[in-house]
Interface confidence: medium
């Protein structure tokens, strides 16, 4: 079970990292800035 939990967490982490990488590529420094609105 602990292996499953670790794998699931790592999978989520990998997805989060992929999203961050995508955002950084598309947005550059904007990704870290305050100029964003809903």
């Amino acid at each position: 079970h602990s292996d499953g939990i670790f794998t699931d967490s790592y999978s989520r982490y990998r997805k989060q990292m992929a999203v961050k990488k995508y955002l950084a590529a598309v947005l550059g420094k904007r990704y870290k800035q305050r100029v964003k609105n809903k």
């Epitope: 550059g28 420094k29 800035q33 305050r34 100029v35 609105n37 809903k38």
Partner: antibody, heavy 127, light 114 residues
Framework: QSLEESGGGLVQPGASLTLTCTAS?????????MCWVRQAPGKGLEWIAC????????TYYASWAKGRFTISKTSSTTVTLHVTSLTAADTATYFC????????????????????WGPGTLVTVSS | DVVMTQTPSPVSAAVGGTVTINCRAS??????LAWYQQKPGQPPKLLMS???TLESGVPSRFKGSGSGTEFTLTISDLECADAATYYC????????????????FGGGTEVVVK
């Protein structure tokens, strides 16, 4: 789609002025950053301020423009720039410009470039 | 804040020739660069964004290249209508919390067509 500025002219030093930008062919119900940029005679482009046209209405100013310049959205097709304590250094053509914004994962980020510009309105500050 | 420096100005070439305009950023801005054309008495016109992506209606004679800190706008098969001042603008935003990305324009390069 077009933008048009109005309100420029000859003004006395120390006076205040309100410039208006009117959009045609599109409305601010879409999410943009509407901005003001000025250009002194024979000089380069100088960004002044932007406002997000969505519900937040967030405003952004160049560091030198804070306090004396105020940008506002006054209707679904108009944005104004109010300027106080005008000096000769404010003599310039004032352009209204649209930042089309980047829609990414539910947020509208500034594109940081301007895809539509108005023809400009000349403000001359002189006694 | 990012500082954009353009060279040379003015630059001239004959009709049918080629001109190259350089734009240098004071820090790495990846490919986040836009180019504008401004003719006397007119507002600037966006030519391209993201270094090389042409806006609709802009002829393919206009070509943008570069990345990082060094960028180039090349205009080939020059026409009289290309006589204008060209501005680059960093579109990467600002790494400073006290400024924004809209204010990073180059000083402009005048193109004279002979």
């Amino acid at each position: 789609q077009s933008l048009e500025e109005s309100g420029g002219g000859l003004v006395q030093p120390g006076a205040s002025l309100t410039l208006t930008c009117t959009a045609s062919g599109f409305s601010f119900s879409s999410n943009y950053y509407m901005c003001w940029v000025r250009q002194a005679p024979g000089k380069g482009l100088e960004w002044i301020a932007c406002i997000f046209t969505g519900s937040s209405g967030s405003t952004y100013y160049a560091s030198w423009a804070k306090g004396r310049f105020t940008i506002s959205k006054t209707s679904s097709t108009t944005v104004t720039l109010h300027v106080t304590s005008l000096t000769a250094a404010d003599t310039a053509t004032y352009f209204c410009a649209r930042d089309r914004a980047l829609s990414v994962v539910g947020y509208f980020y500034a594109a940081y470039y301007f895809d539509f510009w108005g023809p400009g309105t000349l403000v001359t500050v002189s006694s | 804040d990012v500082v954009m420096t353009q060279t040379p100005s003015p630059v001239s070439a004959a009709v049918g020739g080629t001109v190259t305009i350089n734009c240098r950023a004071s820090e790495d801005i990846e490919s986040f660069l836009a180019w504008y054309q401004q003719k006397p008495g007119q507002p600037p016109k966006l030519l391209m964004s993201r270094t090389s992506t042409l806006e609709s209606g802009v002829p393919s004679r206009f070509k943008g290249s570069g990345s990082g800190t060094e960028f180039t706008l090349t205009i080939s098969d020059l026409e009289c209508a290309d006589a204008a001042t060209y501005y680059c603008q960093c579109t990467d935003g600002s790494s400073s919390s006290s400024s924004y990305g809209w204010d990073a324009f180059g000083g402009g390069t005048e193109v004279v067509v002979k």
